[in-house]
């Protein structure tokens, strides 16, 4: 899959889990740089993937509500992430400076259920992500226009 | 209801370029993907890419890469798709589509009526 | 690229028949994580736009006779009719839906 960054350091993957959806997300950040992220797969946090420090975010995710649109922003290192919903929430973590790629899956319809990267002593050196359809697929309505930040706001 | 107006059809000289739209009603499009199909005189379907209208993202099929550009105006609610340096083997009617409702993912319920390009000196 | 090849290419029928066509792709179509087979099945009449028949494999499209069944898994499909009718002469496509999209060549119905 596609990495964002310039990369180096040792490589860190979430959980492969066929059986559960990506249902929250914990993002640390300290020095403007995005230390580390863990997702919440179902009712269980998988391993927290990066550097340590930082101070944590958590966001939870609404039933039936999935991520599917990523932008990430790296200096060197991670310094910034918002993530876009299915419900069009965003989730904006660290600060938005620096090189912005946005990242989303090709196939319509899919969902982030995976990410990767590499990481040093400082934080995330590159983060890839891992598409794929919902375990369940939704009866989409056209989305409720909801908007909330983890941090600060960001225009859509 | 749900529908998808293709603009008419176009005689173009090899080399030149088009521009095609699909105006949609019945649903705004920025809650759908908007996609385009190809259909070359006598032969099969091929798809050419998609374009998020809400924020403009596009996707297309490598073979496609550099042949056309989908854009999408949501104010007037419409899809476009670009050809450029035409040749013959742009001959072809070219469809808009857009998913049915019931699910997420790409089923192409909906198409418009499609427009003949035909590239001719 | 995932390569769709459908056969045969073109078939004769008798109103009443009941007809075959197959649909198999270069790789597995179906998912691991949804255990879905990414795989639409379209007609597409004379003159007309394509419609949508089945997808998933085997679910039918909302309105559509249930003289048309989709079946097969991973990357042999197969289109059956149960019992032709007039109205069914057309060209029909595979799609797959699991990496970008992919049509086949099509099978074209055709009357004895």
């Known amino acids: 899959g596609k990495m964002y960054g310039p990369g180096g350091g040792k490589y860190f993957s979430t959980t492969e889990d066929y059986d559960h959806e990506i249902t929250g997300l914990r993002v640390s950040v300290g020095l403007l740089l995005v230390k580390s992220v863990q997702v919440k797969l179902g009712d269980s946090w998988d391993v927290k993937l990066g550097a340590l420090g930082g101070n944590t975010q958590e966001v939870t995710l609404q039933p039936g509500e999935y991520i599917t649109k990523v932008f990430v922003a790296f200096q060197a290192f991670l310094r910034g992430m918002v993530m876009y919903t299915s419900k069009d929430r965003y989730f904006y973590f660290g600060k938005l400076d620096g090189q912005i790629s946005s990242a989303y899956p090709s196939q319509e319809g899919q969902v982030l259920v995976g990410i990767y990267g590499q990481y040093q002593l400082l934080g995330i050196k590159s983060i890839g992500f891992e598409w794929n359809y919902p375990l369940e697929e939704p009866t989409t309505e056209p989305p409720v226009n909801l908007t909330y930040s983890a941090n600060s706001p960001v225009g859509r | 209801q749900v529908q998808l107006k293709q603009s008419g059809a176009e005689l173009v000289r090899p080399g030149a370029l088009v521009k095609l739209s699909c105006k949609a009603s019945?649903?705004?499009?920025?809650?759908?993907?908007m996609h385009w199909v190809k259909q070359r005189p006598e032969q099969g379907l091929e798809w050419i890419g998609w374009i998020d209208p809400e924020n403009g993202n596009t996707i297309y099929d490598p073979k496609f890469q550099g042949k056309a550009s989908i854009t999408a105006d949501t104010s007037s609610n419409t899809a476009y798709l670009q050809l450029s340096s035409l040749t013959s083997e742009d001959t072809a009617v070219y469809y808009c589509?857009?998913?049915?409702?019931?699910?997420?993912?790409?089923?192409?319920?909906?198409w418009g009526q499609g427009t003949l390009v035909t590239v001719s000196a | 690229d995932i390569v769709m090849t459908q056969s045969p290419s073109s078939l004769a029928v008798s109103a009443g028949e009941k007809v075959t066509m197959s649909c198999k792709s270069s790789q597995s179509l179906l998912n691991s994580r949804t255990r879905k087979n990414y795989l639409a099945w379209y007609q597409q009449k004379p003159g007309q736009s394509p419609k949508l028949l089945i997808y998933?494999?085997?679910t039918r499209e909302s309105g559509v006779p249930d003289r048309f069944t989709g079946s097969g898994s991973g990357t042999d499909f197969t289109l059956t009719i149960s019992s032709v009718q007039a109205e069914d002469l057309a060209v029909y496509y595979c799609k797959q839906s699991y990496n970008l999209y992919t049509f086949g060549a099509g099978t074209k119905l055709e009357l004895k």
């Open positions: 019945g649903f705004n499009i920025k809650d759908y993907y």
């Open positions: 998933w494999a085997s």
């Open positions: 589509a857009r998913r049915a409702i019931t699910t997420a993912t790409a089923w192409f319920a909906y």
